[in-house]
């Protein structure tokens, strides 16, 4: 679809003559008839297949024709066509004299031909005018012509329709050849696909307008490359969506079991030692002078038996005092009025005089102690056993009976049951005092993750296109990890054909 445009510029008929040799009376009042048709080697009468047009009277005898854009007598003349421009044409321009109406001379009787010209040739679509001048014995016509495409038509033959748009169906302008030129931020054959934010993950992200990056379920972040942990997850993170990989010190399916209660809560008071013993479990080992589950209770001042030589202890609010037996004195009944002559040393202890007979000292045999060798040695009073170990007096020595998971003379060494990797199928091992605990990955169970759960959601093979299936944290929940080029909750869509998005 296009327009053949003819610009008439100058007509000369200096003698004012008609084609039949007669003069015009009083002068040749001139109008033009134009016939445009398909190319003919020899111009013949017949319909003007490409169009025809007539002008009003433009002048008398010789005159210059000015451009006129509106009203009657428009110049250039417009011959629109609604077909593919073939590139060739035939044009017949006739100059006529009319004695009648200036504006509609075509309808007047008695019109007479002044002259005519015929042009046959080729013409390419373009904005440039082709100028020509035709002379014959009586007249001269100067003119130019061109073919341009109608609005929204493009190409060598004005056959390519392109209308610029910026809506749901496309976002583009038109190139001179009619091809689409996408507006910034859009791509695709029809410029209807937005260009997502730079770096937006091809599979995990999508957009409905330029520079957006909306994440598919299970992904987050500006580029949709960070996973979202499982809905029920408490103290865990993920490497694939909906996973719950526990932070250090947490266990269980939702990472809600506290494996390190001691560190997280510091339940043991007064400088006591805390030992973890399973999920939410712990033991406090108290320093001397304290007792209670959390060593929160202070023992009485007399509990440490500060009175020697059989003295009896009496508690006061912030202190104590010793009631000494006969022959002893001092804050702790540590001084004696006796001498070696009184045989004060028991259990075979030997007596040594001191201070010119004013006092004595007993040297005790093994397993006895006290100023008079009156006490059997209790080697456990200093709480030498760590990690809740039980202290046992064994004659001249003592031994520590360790709790499960600990060893060493003082139970100070932790036995790592996890060192021998007891958890199968990628289970996470946690050293607890009662032995190792395995947190199993989806699809496995048992104390050592040795039992494969066969009725999980992945058993039915719900993932397409070679995707890897992961069982979620509920037996009937699964996640498909798509290979490159596929998306969708089951990896059922090629990236090139995403599910349609509502715009």
């Amino acid at each position: 679809s296009g327009i053949f445009q003819l610009r008439l510029q100058e007509f000369a008929n200096e003698r004012g003559m008609l084609a039949n040799g007669r003069p015009c009376e009083p002068g040749c009042r001139t109008f033009f008839r134009i016939c445009l048709k398909h190319y003919q080697a020899t111009f013949s009468e017949g319909p003007c297949t490409f169009g025809n047009v007539s002008t009003p009277v433009l002048g008398t005898n010789s005159f210059v024709i000015r451009d006129k854009n509106s009203g009657s007598g428009r110049n250039p003349l417009q011959l629109p066509f609604n077909f593919t421009w073939p590139g060739t044409f035939s044009l017949n321009i006739q100059a006529w004299h009319t004695p009648g109406d200036d504006l509609r001379p075509e309808t007047s009787p008695g019109n007479s031909l002044i002259s005519q010209i015929i042009i046959q040739g080729s013409l390419a679509v373009g904005k440039n005018w082709k100028s020509d001048e035709q002379n014959n014995t009586l007249t001269r016509l100067r003119y130019s012509y061109r073919v341009v495409c109608s609005d929204n038509y493009y190409g060598d033959s004005c056959s390519r329709l392109c209308k610029k748009r910026d809506d749901h169906f496309g976002h583009y302008e038109c190139q001179p050849d009619g091809s689409l030129s996408c507006l910034p931020g859009w791509t695709g054959k029809y410029c209807d696909q937005p260009i997502c934010l730079s770096g937006c993950h091809e599979q995990n992200g999508y957009c409905s307008k330029p520079d957006e990056c909306n994440c598919r379920p299970g992904w987050q972040g500006p580029l949709c490359n960070e996973c979202i942990p499982h809905n029920g997850c408490r103290h865990g993170t993920c490497t694939i969506p909906w996973q719950c990989a526990c932070d250090e010190g947490w266990g269980g399916l939702f990472c809600d079991q506290d494996l390190n209660y001691c560190t997280h809560h510091s339940p043991c008071k007064n400088g006591s030692t805390c030992s973890n013993s399973g999920p939410r479990g712990y033991t406090c080992t108290c320093l001397p002078g304290y007792t209670g589950e959390h060593c929160e209770l202070e023992l009485s001042k007399c509990a440490s038996n500060p009175c020697r030589n059989g003295g009896s202890c009496k508690d006061h609010e912030n202190s104590y005092h010793c009631l000494c037996p006969p022959g002893y004195y001092g804050q702790h009944c540590e001084h004696s009025t006796l001498t070696c002559a009184d045989s004060p040393c028991f259990n075979g202890g030997s007596c040594r005089e001191r201070n010119q007979g004013a006092s004595y000292a007993c040297e005790c045999p093994p397993n006895f102690t006290g100023s008079n060798c009156e006490k059997k040695v209790d080697r456990c009073t200093s709480n030498p056993c760590a990690n809740g170990g039980q202290c046992l007096n064994r004659g001249p020595s003592r031994t520590c009976r360790c709790r499960p998971g600990f060893t060493g003379t003082h139970c100070e060494l932790h036995i790592s049951d996890c060192a021998r990797s007891p958890c199968a199928h990628g289970g996470t091992c946690h050293d607890l005092e009662n032995g190792p605990v395995c947190t199993c990955p989806a699809g496995f169970s048992g104390r050592r993750c040795e039992v494969r759960i066969t009725n999980d959601a992945c058993a039915s093979g719900p993932c397409f296109n070679g995707a890897t299936c992961y069982t979620g944290l509920s037996p009937n929940n699964f996640v498909c990890n798509c290979p490159y080029g596929f998306v969708g909750s089951r990896c059922e869509f090629p990236v090139g054909l995403p599910p349609s998005f509502p715009w």
Epitope: N214, P217, Q220, E226
Partner: antibody, heavy 118, light 107 residues
Framework: EVQLVESGGGLVQPGGSLRLSCAAS????????MAWVRQAPGKGLEWVAT????????SYRDSVKGRFTISRDNAKNSLYLQMNSLRAEDTAVYYC???????????WGQGTLVTVSS | DIQMTQSPSSLSASVGDRVTITCRAS??????LAWYQQKPGKSPKLLIF???VLADGVPSRFSGSGSGTDSTLTISSLQPEDFATYYC?????????FGQGTKLEIK
Amino acid sequence: EVQLVESGGGLVQPGGSLRLSCAASGFTFRHFPMAWVRQAPGKGLEWVATISSSDAWPSYRDSVKGRFTISRDNAKNSLYLQMNSLRAEDTAVYYCARGYYNSPFAYWGQGTLVTVSS
Amino acid sequence: DIQMTQSPSSLSASVGDRVTITCRASQEIYRNLAWYQQKPGKSPKLLIFDTSVLADGVPSRFSGSGSGTDSTLTISSLQPEDFATYYCQQYTYYPPTFGQGTKLEIK
């Protein structure tokens, strides 16, 4: 136990500002995306804004873009919603919730009422 | 935005009844659907996600099903504590959208 406790609601005039806070406990806050969801009196639920766990990416519903700002402080286990240029249609109970725009909202706070009226 | 339409808007039932609430999306949402329960003056509580997965601590009398655009919440035997308003939500497309709610009342 997961707990989300909102605060900062109240009565404000049209064009005014409010800052809502949400204190989170019982889970490792820094691992999880968070959201604000609102409910106008007697009406349904409406997602307002979301922020990713890394604090890198906020998203907003169209009607609040440019007026509301969601942010978080992972060190303080806190989520915030700064609301400016408030309108009568913003009147609602605002809930703090754990979740993203593309995931379910697994845990919700008790809500805080925002009333915009002259 | 994706439109979520719940039906019915309200319904009356008795303790022990089996109740079904449906939710229709204006477009395919690929099982990315959640159901919430909300009691008067309280915050919503997640019941079901991914169309059919029960959230932690939710009684087994609640179940979900569906595919494509249509999803269903079923309560097999109503208990007194189940009378509340129920909302569906899609999270396939941005922005997330909720249904208008279904109020379940005692008959």
